[in-house]
């Protein structure tokens, strides 16, 4: 899978997305990597 | 609202070193990475690299990887890219850019600083 | 690194026009394309993620397709305001790279 910072982010945006946005606060795109997912 | 922004233009002679500023503001400027562009005139767009706010780590395009320095202070949410040992192909207007969650989900671009390498 | 080629390079067309840009990598990307319109001296202001998502604000009227190494951008219905020069970029793998254009002028 894609672990460049912007591939993290939009990744990061969609599982945010379908959360609803709960998640921790400090589950940011510079605080993960992409192992995260 | 979202906004970064960038440094005045610059005219430096060549050889010498420059270091722009980009100032975030309207987000959490530590949760996002910051990456800057260059356009040189009448030309295409070119990735130098990003910085991670959060931690000082960083990812170089090759091409400038020894000349071009990210950084950043977060007490101020201000982003820094210095450029040495400049050329006359360093001419070009210098874009800050960052992809933010929240407040908004959007890459949103500085107003771009226009260096001009000259004696 | 990727390389990336756009075509046309140039498209003369008018209002109400339907247009189709293509991209295409120099190796597969998987969806990871990101499209911008920029307007002379100004800032690339973002269009589409992931290949076909538009961000918040973007038009309808702007829509993207593709994956690996071809993708294309397509308007609808051009609007005066898109008279622009439009470049893609990959993000799939580092350093990030970008098309060299496709500027479209008014017919």
């Known amino acids: 899978a894609c672990d460049t910072a912007t591939c993290v982010t939009h990744r990061l945006a969609g599982l945010l997305s379908r959360s609803g946005g709960v998640v921790k606060n400090n589950f940011v795109p510079t605080n993960v990597g992409s192992k995260a997912f | 609202q979202v906004q970064l922004v960038q440094s005045g233009a610059e005219v430096v002679k060549p050889g010498a070193s420059v270091k722009i500023s980009c100032k975030a503001s309207g987000y959490t400027f530590t949760d996002y990475y910051m990456n800057w562009v260059k356009q040189a005139p009448g030309q295409g767009l070119e990735w130098i690299g990003d910085v991670n706010p959060n931690n000082g780590g960083t990812h170089y395009n090759q091409k400038f990887k020894g000349r071009a320095t990210l950084t950043v202070d977060t007490s101020i949410s201000t982003a820094y890219m210095e450029l040495s040992r400049l050329r006359s192909d360093d001419t070009a207007v210098y874009y800050c850019a960052s992809i933010t969650i929240v407040p908004v989900y959007f890459d949103f671009w500085g107003q771009g600083t226009l260096l001009t390498v000259s004696s | 690194d990727i390389q990336l080629t756009q075509s046309p390079s140039f498209l003369s067309t008018s209002v109400g026009d339907r247009v189709t840009i293509t991209c295409k990598a120099s190796?597969?990307?998987?969806?990871?394309v990101a499209w911008y319109r920029q307007k002379p001296g100004k800032s690339p202001k973002a269009l589409i993620y992931s290949a076909s998502y538009r961000y918040s604000g973007v038009p309808s009227r702007f829509s993207g397709s593709g994956s690996g190494t071809e993708f294309t951008l397509t308007i609808s219905s051009l609007q005066p305001e898109d008279f622009a020069t439009y470049i893609c970029?990959?993000?799939?793998?580092?350093?990030?790279?970008f098309g060299q254009g496709t500027k479209l002028e008014i017919k």
């Open positions: 190796q597969n990307v998987g969806p990871n």
């Open positions: 970029q990959q993000y799939n793998y580092y350093p990030y790279t």
